[in-house]
């Protein structure tokens, strides 16, 4: 299936040009998306090209500026947030990145009614997190690991917690491991729907071992960065959840929410919090051995001013074949009765589907079914449930949006997006206004991305929000590679792959092959999305064939494929890449003397193991920021898939699955190892150990480190990295410079 045919015709050939590396590094062919910042059923805010904050009313067609670019510029604001009572806007400036989601910033409050900044009782700086209440204009913020509350922006703050301490106690914000591997947010506090209560997590990292690495900077002596970071089997953070009444915060103070007994009996995690009403909250907990999850619904007891979580409102989710959930345990979406909910989990056939839970999980009513997976529940209204899945035409790498009418019996299902722009758009997400009165669809490909606005009742398209016309015009004279998404059937396993082919691809010729791999549990690389990136350039200009393969352990194709890697990381992921390469060779257009593999992070681990597989298939390969031993990686992630590195659990496979154990096998390949020295995620330690093992085995290899760079290798390092990798591959494939 050719998704993006090259537009090359003989008459045009002389005006068309190939992609250059410079195009990629400059972001020449990047695309834009449009996500409305909804403020009601029919209104949204958007930051215009000239940086005014504009309010759009869909029904009147009117738009007007509520905050001028001059005001934004006066404090160098890069972000904003309107209070729900529409009286104030916070302006965010001095953005300073911390980890993947977290950052600190300076906040200013602007009064829209009088066009002035609020003076008196200004916010301290820098703030770790700040948010408005869902109603009115109360403010909750985290400063120096403690939570503060303001009833109004100009009021003095009320301090909720006092025990916050850097790297020790975190209130309202996650520690490193919870941020990266559990919550995937910069915050750990949640307002109740009408702002009566504020729930928050406290993380105690006192006993967690610390990772320390040098940050070289410009000073005479390097700084040492210390992060409490639990590696596999190490002591984990201790979490507690509290709720405080924000109307009378001093009255009884924060009340702790009890942990279910079956969870509290051993090490556990808190995984998410969902408010149902102002007086009902739902907490999700997970055993450290992550195959048992408990969803606990708790109610406010007015008489005792406490939170009660009856055992009858505990719902257990257990996996017998792997870990609980997909990458994370899914979160519930409550219905209007405030007790029943919709949730995605595995059905009896091992496919993740939407279920409706009224009383017990055992009596759950399955809402979707089939040999495909429901991926996300976007919104539940009185009469409709909107979700995404990869059902359409049996392509796991697509995403379409569906509506199920839950107000009628039997419920009817409609695909909202399947036939909208069928060639251009096969991978969607959506953003809904209040009560799903309107919604935006954002299509990511395979064609040029487009964002559109729709009526929530009729699904009618109202207008195009962003269609990337400039990008479309810019690409008119570019020889883009062809892309195919197909599948291989091997030993009862389906291996989906994406192949990126040079513009003038000729099946009768031989081409060098580059495998790009990620391959981590519950990931997906073969997706019907648009991208003009480094591998597009390698195909367009350098004439390489690039392939991405989703093997065992990858997502959205059922539990059999997903959980195949349980407790055995580093085996089947590698096998499946190798199997695919052999199949590609059989297709007849691959030069089997010029095959390479590369990957980043988990992909760096897989590419390293593939190179060291002893198959003789690969001439060369690159590992960027690879994991080299699962004993070096974070507990929450690693133990989910591998269990514990103890003798009575899975220590043997922890030891067997290291890159270092295969050092000898790198002798007959060209290996380029790359890592940032300030990688807080996959520590430089991983590559240091690979390098040491290769040196000890007297195996030659190439390496590049990036001083003071983290796992993303951003900024100027990106340019250097891709230039360096390009040279390496061109040398490997004997391509002239």
């Amino acid at each position: 299936i050719v998704l993006r045919p090259s537009r090359v015709h003989n008459s045009e050939e002389n005006t068309m040009r190939a992609l250059t590396l410079k195009d990629i590094l400059n972001g020449t062919f990047s695309y834009k998306t449009f996500f409305p910042n909804w403020i009601s059923g029919q209104e949204y805010l958007h930051q215009s090209a000239d940086n005014n904050i504009v309010l759009y009313n869909i029904e009147t067609g009117q738009s007007y500026t509520i905050l001028s670019n001059r005001t934004m510029k006066s404090v160098n604001a890069s972000n904003y947030g309107l209070s729900p009572d529409r009286q104030f806007v916070y302006l965010e400036s001095d953005y300073s990145k911390l980890w993947r989601y977290s950052y600190t910033a300076t906040y200013y409050i602007y009064d829209l009614s009088n066009g002035e900044f609020v003076r008196g009782n200004e916010l301290p700086r820098p703030i770790q997190y700040l948010c408005w209440s869902p109603v009115g204009s109360k403010l909750a913020y985290v400063y120096q690991n403690n939570i503060y509350l303001k009833q109004r922006p100009g009021d003095p703050p009320f301090q909720i917690t006092f025990n916050g301490r850097e790297n020790k106690i975190f209130n309202g914000i996650p520690d490193w491991v919870y941020e990266e591997e559990m919550l995937a947010t910069k915050y750990a506090l949640w307002w109740s729907p009408n702002g009566k209560f504020l729930a928050y997590a406290e993380f105690n990292d006192t006993d967690i071992p610390v990772i320390a690495y040098s940050y070289y900077g410009d000073e005479q002596y390097p700084r040492t960065i210390n992060i409490p970071y639990p590696k596999a089997g190490a002591k984990n953070p201790v979490v507690r959840i509290f709720i405080i009444d924000t109307t009378y915060p001093a009255y009884v103070g924060p009340q702790e929410v009890p942990v279910p007994a079956m969870i509290a009996s051993s090490d556990y995690y808190f995984s998410w919090l969902t408010w149902v009403t102002d007086e009902r909250v739902c907490l999700q907990w997970l055993k450290r051995v992550q195959n048992v999850s408990v969803l606990s619904i708790c109610d406010f007891r007015e008489d005792w001013q406490t939170w009660d979580c009856p055992k009858t409102q505990e719902h257990i989710e257990e996996s017998r074949t792997g870990w609980a959930g997909g990458f994370f345990v899914s979160t519930p979406v409550f219905s209007y009765d405030a007790i029943s909910y919709y949730k995605i989990f595995s059905d009896k056939d091992g496919y993740k589907h939407i279920h409706y839970i009224k009383d017990t999980v055992e009596n759950a009513i399955q809402i979707t079914s089939g040999k495909w997976e429901a991926i996300n529940i976007f919104r539940v209204t009185q009469d409709s449930l909107f979700y995404s899945s990869n059902e359409f035409e049996e392509y796991p790498g697509r995403r379409n949006i569906y509506r199920i009418s839950i107000g009628s019996y039997p419920p009817s299902k409609k695909c909202v997006t399947c036939h909208l722009r069928k060639e251009r758009c096969q991978y969607y997400t959506a953003s809904f206004s209040d009560y799903a009165k309107y919604y935006a669809l954002v299509c990511y490909g395979p064609g040029i991305p487009i964002s559109t606005l729709h009526d929530g009742r009729t699904d009618q398209e109202i207008k195009i929000l962003e269609e990337n016309k400039e990008l479309e015009n810019a690409l008119k004279n570019i020889q883009l590679p062809k892309e195919e998404i197909k599948k291989l059937e091997v030993d009862e396993i389906t291996l989906w792959y994406k192949m990126i082919l040079p513009p003038q691809f000729d099946r009768s010729k031989k081409y060098p092959l580059l495998i790009q791999v990620y391959g981590g549990p519950c990931s997906q690389s073969v997706r019907s999305v648009f991208a003009v990136n480094w591998i597009s350039y390698l195909a367009s200009k350098e004439g390489m064939v690039i392939a991405l393969v989703d093997g065992r352990g990858t997502a959205f194709q059922g539990d059999k494929l997903l959980y195949a890697v349980y407790r055995k990381l580093g085996v089947y992921e590698v096998e499946d890449q190798i199997t695919a390469v052999r199949k590609f060779i059989e297709m007849g257009f691959i030069d089997e003397k010029r095959i390479a593999i590369w990957g980043w992070s988990y992909g760096g681990y897989v590419s390293s193991l593939a190179l060291a597989s002893g198959t003789g298939l690969f001439k060369c390969g690159i590992a960027v920021a690879p994991v080299s031993s699962w004993e070096y990686y974070a507990s929450v992630y690693t133990e989910r898939f591998m269990g514990l590195p103890t003798k009575d659990d899975n220590l043997e496979h922890y030891k067997n699955s290291t890159v270092m154990a295969r050092a000898e096998y790198f002798r007959n390949v060209d290996y380029l190892l790359i890592h940032g020295t300030a990688d807080d995620n996959v520590h430089f330690q991983n590559s240091a150990q690979i390098a040491k093992a290769l040196v000890n085995a007297q195996v030659d290899f190439q390496a590049m480190w990036y001083s003071d760079q983290n796992h993303g290798l951003s900024g100027l390092s990106t340019n250097h990295l891709y230039t360096h990798m390009t040279h390496f591959l061109k040398q490997c494939f004997s391509l002239s410079d």
């Epitope: 009601s40 059923g41 209104e43 309010l55 009147t60 509520i66 001028s68 829209l112 009614s113 066009g115």
Partner: nanobody, 116 residues
Framework: QVQLQESGGGLVQAGGSLRLSCAVS????????MGWYRQAPGKQRELVAG???????NYADSVKGRFTISRDNGKNTLYLQMNSLKPEDTAVYYC??????????WGQGTQVTVSS
């Protein structure tokens, strides 16, 4: 361009009532979020009450329980019913979008004076 015209102000005794009106020219008034604002002498302008397109209303703490914002979609008119008036309610009252439009989009307003 939408035009806003306030009326209904006047002099009233403390404890008395007034009803302010704001005529709005422009289509589909019903879905516009509209607000009443006021500015007392020597003070900054402040929001008194706001009403969204979904008829959800919001009030300043100082007027809660005394003032009521409403709209008549047929007449394209916004109202503010003010009861139990206090001397501190003395101000020029303006209507505008909610949140207000940036810049000089404020009308003449209507003066409300509450005598003790």
């Amino acid at each position: 361009q939408v035009q806003l015209q306030e009326s209904g102000g006047g002099l009233v005794q403390a404890g008395g009532s007034l009803r302010l009106s704001c005529a709005v020219s422009g289509r589909l008034f019903s879905t516009n979020a509209m607000g009443w604002y006021r500015q007392a002498p020597g003070k900054q302008r402040e929001l008194v009450a706001g009403i969204t397109g979904g008829d959800r209303s919001n009030y300043a703490d100082s007027v809660k329980g005394r003032f009521t914002i409403s709209r008549d979609n047929g007449k394209n008119t916004l109202y503010l019913q003010m009861n139990s008036l206090k001397p501190e309610d003395t101000a020029v009252y303006y209507c505008n979008f909610y949140p207000p439009i940036v810049g000089d989009y404020w009308g003449q307003g209507t003066q409300v004076t509450v005598s003790s």
